[in-house]
């Protein structure tokens, strides 16, 4: 089934429009913004999710936008161009013909240029480091229990194969989750680490992308794990190309 047959919804992506117009009256779901058909048995690509997010009416957003002085991860939200498979196109441009190259998770990896900018290939992000700080608790979590709980979460909630969770580090109150997935390791049907990290990031922020599923309730042996800040670092198979001016 591509979607929940009973009420024709997409369990893995609430930013869809679904109708029973697939083959044999099957439920078929299309992503908002792009209109692309999505497979509701797995995570939707980050590119299609960002596109859907940007197409949503402004007043439908439930969270308050941070002030203009707030720091966001790189360039923050933008309306991306996705390829027919739902992946980010290597070159992204805005309405004012400013262009830049992105990696497979849609993060800018070059200086901004004009329409003459060339991005030869979509460079894969093969290593993601999710850096979390949890709220104070009576004592530190047991490392092994915390490690197992986070690995279980990525398997069960995001359907990420256990081999792609490389490590879970813990030094109270900092938790680091390392995801690794080389091009050669990723088989057909495997969830992409970039998509899993994006779903996790949205879950942590209380903006779950899942339909009809409770928000993320992380517990370690019954003790709530409440995250107060998240930083995500992306490492690409080919190092980014920024000018020295930006680096200084």
């Amino acid at each position: 089934h591509t979607a929940a047959q009973d009420n024709c919804t997409c369990p893995t992506n609430k930013m869809t429009v679904c109708s029973p117009d697939g083959p044999g009256g099957r439920c078929q779901c299309r992503a908002l913004g792009s209109g692309m058909a999505v497979d509701c048995s797995t995570l939707t690509s980050k590119c299609l999710l960002l596109k859907a997010r940007m197409s949503a009416p402004k007043n439908a957003r439930t969270l308050v936008r941070p002030s203009e002085h707030a720091l966001v991860d790189n360039d923050g939200l933008y309306d991306p161009d996705c390829d027919p498979e739902g992946r980010f196109k290597a070159r992204q441009c805005n309405q004012t013909s400013v262009c830049w190259c992105v990696n497979s998770v849609g993060v800018r990896r070059t200086d901004k240029g004009d329409l003459s900018l060339r991005c030869d290939e979509l460079v894969r992000t093969h290593h993601i480091l999710i850096d979390l700080r949890h709220r104070p608790t009576a004592g530190a979590f047991n490392h092994s229990d915390l490690d197992a709980e986070l690995r279980r979460l990525f398997r069960e909630r995001y359907r990420l194969h256990p081999k792609f969770v490389a490590a879970v580090h813990y030094e109270q109150p900092t938790i680091q989750i390392e995801l690794r997935q080389n091009t050669s390791q990723k088989a057909a049907g495997d969830v992409d680490i970039g998509d899993a990290a994006y779903y996790f990031e949205r879950d942590i922020k209380g903006e779950s992308l899942f339909q009809g599923r409770g928000g993320l309730d992380l517990r370690v042996r019954g003790e709530p794990l409440q995250v107060e800040r998240t930083l995500i670092y992306y490492l690409d198979e080919i190092p980014p190309k920024f000018s020295m001016k930006r680096l200084t």
Epitope: S144, A148, R152, R155, E156, P162, K163
Partner: antibody
Framework: EVQLVQSGPEVKKPGASVKVSCKAS????????IGWVRQAPGQGLEWIGE????????YYTQKFKGRVTMTADTSTSTAYMELSSLRSEDTAVYYC??????????WGQGTLVTVSS | DIQLTQSPSSLSASVGDRVTITCSAS?????MYWYQQKPGKAPKLLIY???TLQSGVPSRFSGSGSGTDFTLTISSLQPEDFATYYC?????????FGQGTKLEIK
């Protein structure tokens, strides 16, 4: 072909320990998880815990914590489950099962452990 | 811990019958898994993610439900379907199973 082959039946006295092995073949051992489940005679299935074979990360259910030890030998693609301080109610068939993006997709044939004085 | 309660605990039916087994969770779970076990054998995964048939499982088996209430249906019982069926969740540690439903020949 994915296979999990477990060690043979064991008879143990109360207070003793038992170590059950689960030899894997047909897949990359360290990419997966091995879970352990037991079934007392005529009863249902009870989950004991699991080990992530790549990292060695282990989770035991509270009921068995302190009495169970799960290990893995990556050189022989074998997982082990040791249960100590055995009592008569530990008499059961012990199963190993492979985990991936499913909790258990392939199961071993089971190992009967009998605890009797 | 999330408790799973199956009903009925046992069931007598005939070949060709339509059979429904329910599994009720003590709190909401994301998905339900169903296993079939025959005497002296290991359990076999039948249905994952509530409604998806494992490869090789006949289409007479189906699963449905959400939240706390889930169902396994066998549309037309075959002789080889007489076995014990278990539901299972892994939405939170510890993973738990229902107590089982024994399906017997009438």
């Amino acid at each position: 072909e994915v296979q999990l082959v477990q060690s043979g039946p064991e008879v143990k006295k109360p207070g003793a320990s038992v170590k059950v092995s689960c030899k894997a073949s047909g897949f990359t051992f360290t990419d997966y998880v091995i879970g352990w489940v037991r079934q007392a005679p005529g009863q249902g299935l009870e989950w004991i815990g699991e080990i992530y074979l790549g990292s060695g990360t282990i989770y035991y259910t509270q009921k068995f914590k302190g009495r169970v030890t799960m290990t893995a030998d990556t050189s022989t693609s074998t997982a082990y489950m040791e249960l100590s301080s055995l009592r008569s109610e530990d008499t059961a068939v012990y199963y190993c099962a492979r985990g991936s993006i499913f909790p258990f997709d392939y199961w071993g044939q089971g190992t009967l452990v009998t605890v009797s004085s | 811990d999330i408790q799973l309660t199956q009903s009925p605990s046992s069931l007598s039916a005939s070949v060709g019958d339509r059979v429904t087994i329910t599994c009720s969770a003590s709190s909401s779970v994301s998905y339900m898994y169903w296993y079939q076990q025959k005497p002296g054998k290991a359990p076999k995964l039948l249905i994952y993610d509530t409604s998806t048939l494992q490869s090789g499982v006949p289409s007479r088996f189906s699963g449905s439900g959400s939240g706390t209430d889930f169902t396994l249906t066998i549309s037309s019982l075959q002789p080889e379907d007489f076995a014990t069926y278990y539901c299972q969740q892994w939405s939170s540690y510890p993973y738990t199973f229902g107590q089982g439903t024994k399906l017997e020949i009438k």
